[in-house]
Interface confidence: low
Protein backbone atom coordinates (compact mmCIF):
# COMPACT_ATOMS: atom_id res chain seq x y z
CA UNK A 1 0.00 0.00 0.00
CA UNK A 2 1.31 3.44 -0.93
CA UNK A 3 1.16 5.58 2.20
CA UNK A 4 3.57 8.34 1.25
CA UNK A 5 2.89 11.90 0.21
CA UNK A 6 4.97 14.29 -1.87
CA UNK A 7 5.35 17.85 -0.71
CA UNK A 8 6.45 20.28 -3.41
CA UNK A 9 7.22 23.96 -3.74
CA UNK A 10 3.85 24.25 -5.49
CA UNK A 11 3.16 27.17 -7.81
CA UNK A 12 6.25 29.34 -8.03
CA UNK A 13 7.41 32.30 -10.05
CA UNK A 14 10.81 33.66 -10.90
CA UNK A 15 12.35 36.44 -12.94
CA UNK A 16 13.62 36.01 -16.47
CA UNK A 17 17.39 35.52 -16.44
CA UNK A 18 17.34 34.36 -12.83
CA UNK A 19 17.41 30.89 -11.30
CA UNK A 20 14.97 28.77 -9.31
CA UNK A 21 15.18 25.66 -7.15
CA UNK A 22 12.61 22.95 -7.78
CA UNK A 23 12.16 20.78 -4.70
CA UNK A 24 10.02 17.83 -3.71
CA UNK A 25 10.00 15.90 -0.47
CA UNK A 26 8.60 12.40 0.05
CA UNK A 27 7.23 11.75 3.51
CA UNK A 28 5.01 9.34 5.46
CA UNK A 29 6.61 6.23 4.02
CA UNK A 30 9.53 3.99 4.91
CA UNK A 31 10.01 3.04 1.25
CA UNK A 32 13.51 3.32 -0.15
CA UNK A 33 13.95 5.95 -2.87
CA UNK A 34 15.82 4.26 -5.72
CA UNK A 35 15.61 7.07 -8.26
CA UNK A 36 14.13 10.52 -8.81
CA UNK A 37 13.34 11.74 -12.32
CA UNK A 38 12.78 15.42 -13.06
CA UNK A 39 10.82 16.23 -16.18
CA UNK A 40 9.22 19.16 -17.89
CA UNK A 41 6.04 18.32 -19.80
CA UNK A 42 7.24 14.89 -21.00
CA UNK A 43 10.84 15.96 -21.51
CA UNK A 44 13.45 14.44 -19.25
CA UNK A 45 15.59 17.05 -17.45
CA UNK A 46 17.58 14.98 -15.01
CA UNK A 47 17.82 11.71 -13.11
CA UNK A 48 19.14 11.23 -9.61
CA UNK A 49 19.81 7.53 -9.07
CA UNK A 50 20.41 6.45 -5.48
CA UNK A 51 23.44 4.37 -6.47
CA UNK A 52 24.76 6.19 -9.51
CA UNK A 53 24.16 9.82 -8.68
CA UNK A 54 23.07 12.56 -11.06
CA UNK A 55 22.66 12.53 -14.82
CA UNK A 56 21.56 15.69 -16.60
CA UNK A 57 20.03 15.35 -20.07
CA UNK A 58 22.47 16.68 -22.69
CA UNK A 59 20.13 19.39 -23.98
CA UNK A 60 19.85 20.88 -20.47
CA UNK A 61 23.46 20.56 -19.29
CA UNK A 62 24.16 24.29 -19.66
CA UNK A 63 21.15 25.45 -17.64
CA UNK A 64 20.35 22.73 -15.10
CA UNK A 65 22.35 22.00 -11.98
CA UNK A 66 21.77 19.07 -9.63
CA UNK A 67 20.63 19.73 -6.10
CA UNK A 68 20.29 20.82 -3.48
CA UNK A 69 19.55 17.31 -2.27
CA UNK A 70 17.15 15.62 -4.67
CA UNK A 71 16.04 19.02 -5.97
CA UNK A 72 16.98 20.68 -9.22
CA UNK A 73 18.26 24.18 -9.95
CA UNK A 74 17.20 25.86 -13.20
CA UNK A 75 19.41 28.73 -14.32
CA UNK A 76 19.25 31.49 -16.94
CA UNK A 77 15.47 31.28 -17.00
CA UNK A 78 13.52 32.29 -20.07
CA UNK A 79 9.79 32.82 -20.57
CA UNK A 80 9.76 29.50 -22.42
CA UNK A 81 10.60 27.76 -19.12
CA UNK A 82 7.10 28.57 -17.88
CA UNK A 83 5.10 25.39 -17.38
CA UNK A 84 4.67 22.21 -15.39
CA UNK A 85 7.57 20.33 -13.82
CA UNK A 86 7.30 16.89 -12.28
CA UNK A 87 9.39 15.06 -9.72
CA UNK A 88 8.91 11.32 -10.07
CA UNK A 89 10.08 9.27 -7.10
CA UNK A 90 10.75 5.59 -7.77
CA UNK A 91 10.58 3.74 -4.49
CA UNK A 92 10.89 0.20 -3.26
CA UNK A 93 8.55 -1.45 -2.45
CA UNK A 94 5.85 1.24 -2.78
CA UNK A 95 6.25 2.11 -6.47
CA UNK A 96 6.07 5.54 -8.08
CA UNK A 97 5.11 8.86 -6.49
CA UNK A 98 4.74 12.01 -8.61
CA UNK A 99 4.80 15.65 -7.53
CA UNK A 100 3.86 18.65 -9.67
CA UNK A 101 5.31 22.15 -9.66
CA UNK A 102 4.10 25.01 -11.85
CA UNK A 103 6.73 27.59 -12.70
CA UNK A 104 5.91 30.98 -14.15
CA UNK A 105 8.84 33.00 -15.49
CA UNK A 106 8.06 36.71 -15.35
CA UNK A 107 9.51 39.62 -17.29
CA UNK A 108 9.19 42.00 -14.34
CA UNK A 109 10.38 41.90 -10.75
CA UNK A 110 7.07 40.81 -9.24
CA UNK A 111 8.06 37.15 -8.94
CA UNK A 112 7.06 35.52 -5.68
CA UNK A 113 7.14 32.00 -4.32
CA UNK A 114 3.77 30.29 -4.00
CA UNK A 115 2.57 28.27 -1.05
CA UNK A 116 3.71 24.70 -0.48
CA UNK A 117 1.13 22.01 -1.00
CA UNK A 118 0.83 18.24 -0.77
CA UNK A 119 -0.07 15.60 -3.34
CA UNK A 120 -1.28 12.29 -1.84
Amino acid sequence: MMTGTIETTGNISAEKGGSIILQCHLSSTTAQVTQVNWEQQDQLLAICNADLGWHISPSFKDRVAPGPGLGLTLQSLTVNDTGEYFCIYHTYPDGTYTGRIFLEVLESSVAEHGARFQIP
Epitope: Q35, D51, L52, I88, H90, G95, T96
Partner: antibody, heavy 118, light 107 residues
Protein backbone atom coordinates in the same frame (compact mmCIF):
# COMPACT_ATOMS: atom_id res chain seq x y z
CA UNK B 1 34.00 4.36 -33.09
CA UNK B 2 32.50 3.12 -29.84
CA UNK B 3 33.05 -0.61 -29.41
CA UNK B 4 32.52 -3.16 -26.66
CA UNK B 5 34.34 -6.49 -26.95
CA UNK B 6 33.40 -9.31 -24.60
CA UNK B 7 35.21 -12.43 -23.46
CA UNK B 8 34.52 -15.84 -24.98
CA UNK B 9 31.89 -18.49 -24.25
CA UNK B 10 31.97 -20.35 -20.95
CA UNK B 11 30.63 -23.73 -19.79
CA UNK B 12 30.11 -24.04 -16.03
CA UNK B 13 28.71 -26.56 -13.58
CA UNK B 14 25.80 -25.71 -11.25
CA UNK B 15 27.02 -23.92 -8.13
CA UNK B 16 30.10 -22.51 -9.86
CA UNK B 17 30.85 -18.88 -10.72
CA UNK B 18 31.49 -17.14 -14.01
CA UNK B 19 33.24 -13.84 -14.73
CA UNK B 20 32.58 -12.10 -18.03
CA UNK B 21 34.67 -9.16 -19.25
CA UNK B 22 33.79 -6.26 -21.53
CA UNK B 23 36.55 -4.10 -23.00
CA UNK B 24 35.56 -0.65 -24.21
CA UNK B 25 37.29 1.34 -26.93
CA UNK B 26 36.67 4.41 -29.06
CA UNK B 27 35.53 6.64 -26.20
CA UNK B 28 36.46 7.73 -22.70
CA UNK B 29 35.58 4.71 -20.54
CA UNK B 30 34.45 6.84 -17.60
CA UNK B 31 31.94 8.84 -19.65
CA UNK B 32 29.36 6.06 -20.00
CA UNK B 33 27.68 3.76 -17.52
CA UNK B 34 28.16 0.07 -18.25
CA UNK B 35 25.10 -2.16 -18.03
CA UNK B 36 24.79 -5.92 -18.09
CA UNK B 37 21.80 -7.53 -19.78
CA UNK B 38 21.14 -11.21 -20.33
CA UNK B 39 19.04 -13.23 -22.75
CA UNK B 40 18.12 -16.85 -22.13
CA UNK B 41 17.72 -19.04 -25.24
CA UNK B 42 14.61 -18.01 -27.16
CA UNK B 43 13.67 -15.50 -24.46
CA UNK B 44 13.54 -11.75 -24.02
CA UNK B 45 16.15 -9.45 -22.49
CA UNK B 46 16.67 -8.97 -18.76
CA UNK B 47 18.61 -6.10 -17.17
CA UNK B 48 21.04 -7.30 -14.48
CA UNK B 49 22.63 -4.08 -13.29
CA UNK B 50 24.85 -1.12 -14.08
CA UNK B 51 28.19 0.25 -12.91
CA UNK B 52 29.42 3.81 -13.18
CA UNK B 53 33.04 3.35 -14.36
CA UNK B 54 34.04 6.76 -13.00
CA UNK B 55 33.38 6.29 -9.30
CA UNK B 56 32.47 2.60 -9.29
CA UNK B 57 28.98 2.88 -7.87
CA UNK B 58 26.58 0.13 -8.81
CA UNK B 59 22.84 -0.38 -9.16
CA UNK B 60 21.55 -3.94 -9.29
CA UNK B 61 18.28 -5.48 -10.32
CA UNK B 62 16.93 -6.77 -6.99
CA UNK B 63 16.50 -10.20 -8.58
CA UNK B 64 20.28 -10.59 -8.86
CA UNK B 65 21.40 -8.79 -5.72
CA UNK B 66 23.69 -10.99 -3.66
CA UNK B 67 24.65 -13.21 -6.60
CA UNK B 68 26.20 -10.71 -8.98
CA UNK B 69 29.31 -8.56 -8.61
CA UNK B 70 30.24 -5.80 -11.02
CA UNK B 71 33.70 -4.29 -11.13
CA UNK B 72 35.77 -2.25 -13.53
CA UNK B 73 39.43 -1.61 -14.30
CA UNK B 74 39.92 1.94 -15.50
CA UNK B 75 43.50 1.29 -16.59
CA UNK B 76 42.34 -1.24 -19.20
CA UNK B 77 38.86 0.25 -19.87
CA UNK B 78 37.33 -3.08 -18.95
CA UNK B 79 34.17 -3.89 -17.02
CA UNK B 80 33.51 -7.24 -15.37
CA UNK B 81 30.39 -9.07 -14.29
CA UNK B 82 30.67 -12.08 -12.00
CA UNK B 83 27.66 -14.30 -11.30
CA UNK B 84 27.84 -16.80 -8.45
CA UNK B 85 25.90 -19.92 -7.45
CA UNK B 86 25.07 -20.69 -11.04
CA UNK B 87 22.01 -22.75 -11.90
CA UNK B 88 20.71 -24.14 -15.18
CA UNK B 89 18.33 -21.19 -15.63
CA UNK B 90 21.36 -18.87 -15.76
CA UNK B 91 22.22 -20.33 -19.17
CA UNK B 92 22.03 -17.27 -21.39
CA UNK B 93 23.90 -14.84 -23.57
CA UNK B 94 25.26 -12.07 -21.36
CA UNK B 95 25.67 -8.63 -22.96
CA UNK B 96 27.40 -5.50 -21.82
CA UNK B 97 25.75 -2.31 -23.07
CA UNK B 98 26.47 1.31 -22.34
CA UNK B 99 24.37 4.38 -21.81
CA UNK B 100 24.94 8.03 -21.12
CA UNK B 101 22.46 10.33 -19.41
CA UNK B 102 19.29 8.36 -19.96
CA UNK B 103 18.62 4.70 -19.58
CA UNK B 104 18.38 3.21 -23.02
CA UNK B 105 21.30 1.23 -24.38
CA UNK B 106 23.24 2.76 -27.26
CA UNK B 107 26.10 0.35 -27.88
CA UNK B 108 26.15 -3.38 -27.14
CA UNK B 109 28.89 -5.95 -26.88
CA UNK B 110 28.73 -9.04 -29.08
CA UNK B 111 27.51 -11.18 -26.19
CA UNK B 112 29.02 -14.02 -24.17
CA UNK B 113 27.24 -17.37 -24.04
CA UNK B 114 27.32 -18.90 -20.58
CA UNK B 115 26.10 -22.50 -20.42
CA UNK B 116 25.38 -24.03 -17.02
CA UNK B 117 25.18 -27.80 -17.23
CA UNK B 118 26.09 -30.74 -15.04
CA UNK C 1 8.74 -3.59 -11.42
CA UNK C 2 7.11 -2.20 -14.56
CA UNK C 3 5.85 -5.02 -16.80
CA UNK C 4 6.08 -4.49 -20.56
CA UNK C 5 3.51 -6.33 -22.68
CA UNK C 6 4.26 -6.53 -26.38
CA UNK C 7 1.84 -7.60 -29.09
CA UNK C 8 1.71 -9.49 -31.28
CA UNK C 9 4.36 -12.00 -30.23
CA UNK C 10 4.91 -12.81 -33.90
CA UNK C 11 3.61 -11.71 -37.28
CA UNK C 12 4.05 -12.65 -40.92
CA UNK C 13 4.38 -9.90 -43.50
CA UNK C 14 5.61 -9.28 -47.01
CA UNK C 15 8.19 -6.86 -48.33
CA UNK C 16 6.51 -3.46 -48.75
CA UNK C 17 3.92 -4.06 -46.03
CA UNK C 18 3.23 -1.58 -43.27
CA UNK C 19 3.89 -3.22 -39.90
CA UNK C 20 2.82 -2.00 -36.47
CA UNK C 21 3.99 -3.41 -33.14
CA UNK C 22 2.44 -2.40 -29.82
CA UNK C 23 3.96 -2.14 -26.36
CA UNK C 24 1.91 -1.59 -23.21
CA UNK C 25 3.66 -0.82 -19.90
CA UNK C 26 1.90 -1.74 -16.66
CA UNK C 27 2.04 1.88 -15.52
CA UNK C 28 2.53 5.37 -16.94
CA UNK C 29 6.08 5.72 -18.26
CA UNK C 30 5.46 9.08 -19.98
CA UNK C 31 7.66 8.99 -23.10
CA UNK C 32 10.52 6.92 -21.66
CA UNK C 33 10.41 4.04 -24.11
CA UNK C 34 13.02 2.55 -26.43
CA UNK C 35 12.75 0.05 -29.27
CA UNK C 36 15.44 -2.41 -30.34
CA UNK C 37 15.90 -4.70 -33.33
CA UNK C 38 17.64 -8.04 -32.94
CA UNK C 39 18.60 -10.44 -35.70
CA UNK C 40 19.48 -14.09 -34.96
CA UNK C 41 22.94 -14.44 -33.48
CA UNK C 42 23.39 -10.68 -33.16
CA UNK C 43 23.22 -8.15 -30.35
CA UNK C 44 20.18 -5.86 -30.06
CA UNK C 45 20.39 -2.58 -31.97
CA UNK C 46 18.81 0.63 -30.70
CA UNK C 47 16.16 1.96 -33.10
CA UNK C 48 14.10 4.49 -31.15
CA UNK C 49 14.38 6.23 -27.77
CA UNK C 50 12.17 8.68 -25.91
CA UNK C 51 9.24 6.97 -27.67
CA UNK C 52 9.76 8.69 -31.02
CA UNK C 53 13.37 9.81 -31.49
CA UNK C 54 15.21 7.77 -34.13
CA UNK C 55 18.67 6.58 -33.17
CA UNK C 56 21.57 7.58 -35.38
CA UNK C 57 21.65 5.79 -38.72
CA UNK C 58 18.16 4.26 -38.43
CA UNK C 59 16.16 4.47 -41.68
CA UNK C 60 13.19 6.84 -41.71
CA UNK C 61 10.76 3.99 -42.50
CA UNK C 62 10.93 3.25 -38.76
CA UNK C 63 8.88 5.48 -36.49
CA UNK C 64 7.80 5.38 -32.87
CA UNK C 65 4.78 6.96 -31.26
CA UNK C 66 2.72 6.94 -28.09
CA UNK C 67 3.05 7.99 -24.47
CA UNK C 68 1.84 6.90 -21.06
CA UNK C 69 0.76 3.27 -21.31
CA UNK C 70 0.52 2.64 -25.05
CA UNK C 71 3.30 2.80 -27.62
CA UNK C 72 3.76 1.67 -31.18
CA UNK C 73 6.67 0.98 -33.50
CA UNK C 74 5.75 1.28 -37.17
CA UNK C 75 7.71 0.15 -40.21
CA UNK C 76 6.13 2.01 -43.10
CA UNK C 77 7.40 -0.26 -45.86
CA UNK C 78 8.99 -3.50 -44.74
CA UNK C 79 12.36 -4.28 -46.31
CA UNK C 80 14.12 -7.67 -46.50
CA UNK C 81 16.62 -6.61 -43.83
CA UNK C 82 13.81 -5.75 -41.39
CA UNK C 83 12.86 -9.37 -40.70
CA UNK C 84 13.98 -9.68 -37.08
CA UNK C 85 12.72 -9.62 -33.51
CA UNK C 86 11.77 -6.26 -31.98
CA UNK C 87 11.81 -5.43 -28.27
CA UNK C 88 10.50 -2.47 -26.33
CA UNK C 89 12.15 -1.27 -23.11
CA UNK C 90 11.16 1.40 -20.65
CA UNK C 91 13.86 3.81 -19.50
CA UNK C 92 11.89 5.42 -16.72
CA UNK C 93 12.99 3.98 -13.38
CA UNK C 94 15.13 1.03 -12.32
CA UNK C 95 14.90 -1.85 -12.92
CA UNK C 96 14.67 -1.25 -16.64
CA UNK C 97 12.55 -3.97 -18.20
CA UNK C 98 11.93 -5.24 -21.73
CA UNK C 99 8.88 -6.52 -23.55
CA UNK C 100 8.63 -10.16 -24.58
CA UNK C 101 9.52 -9.40 -28.19
CA UNK C 102 7.77 -9.46 -31.56
CA UNK C 103 9.18 -11.70 -34.26
CA UNK C 104 8.58 -10.35 -37.76
CA UNK C 105 8.70 -13.21 -40.25
CA UNK C 106 8.42 -13.47 -44.03
CA UNK C 107 4.96 -14.39 -45.27
Amino acid sequence: QLQLVQSGAEVKKPGASVKVSCKASGYSFTDYNMNWVRQAPGQSLEWIGVINPNHGTISYNQKFKGRVTMTRDQSTSTAYMELNSLRSEDTAVYYCANNWDVWYFDVWGQGTLVTVSS
Amino acid sequence: DIQMTQSPSSLSASVGDRVTITCRPSENIYSYLAWYQQKPGNSPKLLVYNAKALAEGVPSRFSGSGSGTQFTLTISSLQPEDFATYYCQHHFGAPWTFGGGTKVEIK
